[in-house]
Amino acid sequence: ELCDDDPPEIPHATFKAMAYKEGTMLNCECKRGFRRIKSGSLYMLCTGNSSHSSWDNQCQCTSSATRNTTKQVTPQPEEQKERKTTEMQSPMQPVDQASLPGHCREPPPWENEATERIYHFVVGQMVYYQCVQGYRALHRGPAESVCKMTHGKTRWTQPQLICTGEMETSQFPGEEKPQASPEGRPESETSC
């Protein structure tokens, strides 16, 4: 079941999933000057069964000939400054990611892909937060958020993370301390 909204925004932080639950959509977005091909998929889908999952559909971008002539669409300043969602950085692949049943790995990039990946997560998905460069993490608890179903509605738990403006970066779980790898957590505590 799809989560109704996006994971919470934390000032000066981005989030990332280490693996994607079956049913997750990744929108086929293209960088400026390119657009999804007319016969191309709207999104990729993490699909499969408990033993093997993979991304269905392929995203394809083509050079954009026709642009809007109206200039009403202008990026918001805060969106130009700082991306809140999953960025296309060099994706870290924890070694145990593939062994998670019912999950997909981070899909490989496609040609002329947009810089930001737009996911539609499903109930039970966990995402992990890190402070953007130039900010340091103050943890009051886990820097993660889980999409849960309560009373027929979906909601994301609030990550216990504050990013302060000090020149030091915090890492996603598993990037620095392998013993703290989140994938060891039982799935039951995130599923509804």
């Epitope: 799809l2 109704d4 909204d5 996006d6 049913g23 959509m25 929108n27 977005e29 293209c30 400026r32 657009r35 007319k38 016969s39 191309g40 998929s41 709207l42 999104y43 889908l45 699909t47 269905d56 559909n57 954009s64 026709t66 642009r67 809007n68 200039k71 669409v73 990026p75 918001q76 969106e79 809140k84 969602t85 947009a114 930001e116 737009i118 539609h120």
Partner: antibody, heavy 114, light 107 residues
Framework: QVQLQQSGAELVRPGTSVKMSCKAA????????IGWIKQRPGHGLEWIGD????????NYNEKFKGKATLTADTFSSTAYMQLSSLTSEDSAIYYC???????WGQGTLVTVSS | DNVLTQSQKFMSTSVGDRVSVTCKAS??????VAWYQQKPGQSPKALIY???YRYSGVPDRFTGSGSGTDFTLTISNVQSEDLAEYFC?????????FGGGTKLEMK
């Protein structure tokens, strides 16, 4: 909570134009395509086109090229559709949709009558 | 354009029944199909995406299946609140198209 709030019903004269709005809330407006759908009794649902507010891109159903113009204003998180040279065939309910068709506005009823 | 055909315009059912609404595409769409429910005077409500995945809050008596050109929405243990019109849609290629709809009525 995701919401798409559409503007109210319109009664318009043949040959004129109408511009309706769709205000999005509860998600990042610039991340997702906004689609527009026409519904007429006996004609089912027809996809008019869509707009990506973050990328300034539009796609149109050939049938509605020249009839519909899609625009968006990211500051107010509002998408607009203008219909021109209206005829009785344009009398319908128009829906906007967001987040890959997961959410639909309540619809705007357009009645073209002299 | 890819034409979606819902051959049955009307279907009669009773509370507790199991009913299957079918949708046939004129061209292969993979699993890029959605199902919507529309009640009189209301907007369509998204039920299923990617042929078989339920949206949140959709009761599990609604199941979608199929791929390629043939798709089915099955409602098991029909409830009175399920009486509505059901539309399929393909979003595999532009222009996106909808089926003509199937109205579920009480016997």
């Amino acid at each position: 909570q995701v919401q798409l709030q559409q503007s109210g019903a319109e009664l318009v004269r043949p040959g004129t134009s109408v511009k309706m709005s769709c205000k999005a809330a509860g998600y990042t407006f610039t991340n997702y395509w906004i689609g527009w759908i026409k519904q007429r009794p006996g004609h089912g649902l027809e996809w008019i086109g869509d707009i990506h507010p973050g990328g300034d891109y539009t796609n149109y159903n050939e049938k509605f090229k020249g009839k519909a113009t899609l625009t968006a204003d990211t500051f107010s998180s509002t998408a607009y559709m203008q219909l021109s040279s209206l005829t009785s065939e344009d009398s319908a309910i128009y829906y906007c949709t967001g987040r890959n068709f997961a959410y639909w506005g309540q619809g705007t009823l357009v009645t073209v009558s002299s | 354009d890819n034409v979606l055909t819902q051959s049955q315009k009307f279907m009669s059912t009773s509370v507790g029944d199991r009913v299957s609404v079918t949708c046939k595409a004129s061209q292969n769409v993979g699993t890029n199909v959605a199902w919507y429910q529309q009640k009189p005077g209301q907007s369509p409500k998204a039920l299923i995406y990617s042929a078989s995945y339920r949206y949140s809050g959709v009761p599990d008596r609604f199941t979608g299946s199929g791929s390629g050109t043939d798709f089915t929405l099955t409602i098991s243990n029909v409830q009175s609140e399920d009486l509505a019109e059901y539309f399929c849609q393909q979003y595999n290629s532009y222009p996106y198209t909808f089926g003509g709809g199937t109205k579920l009525e009480m016997k």
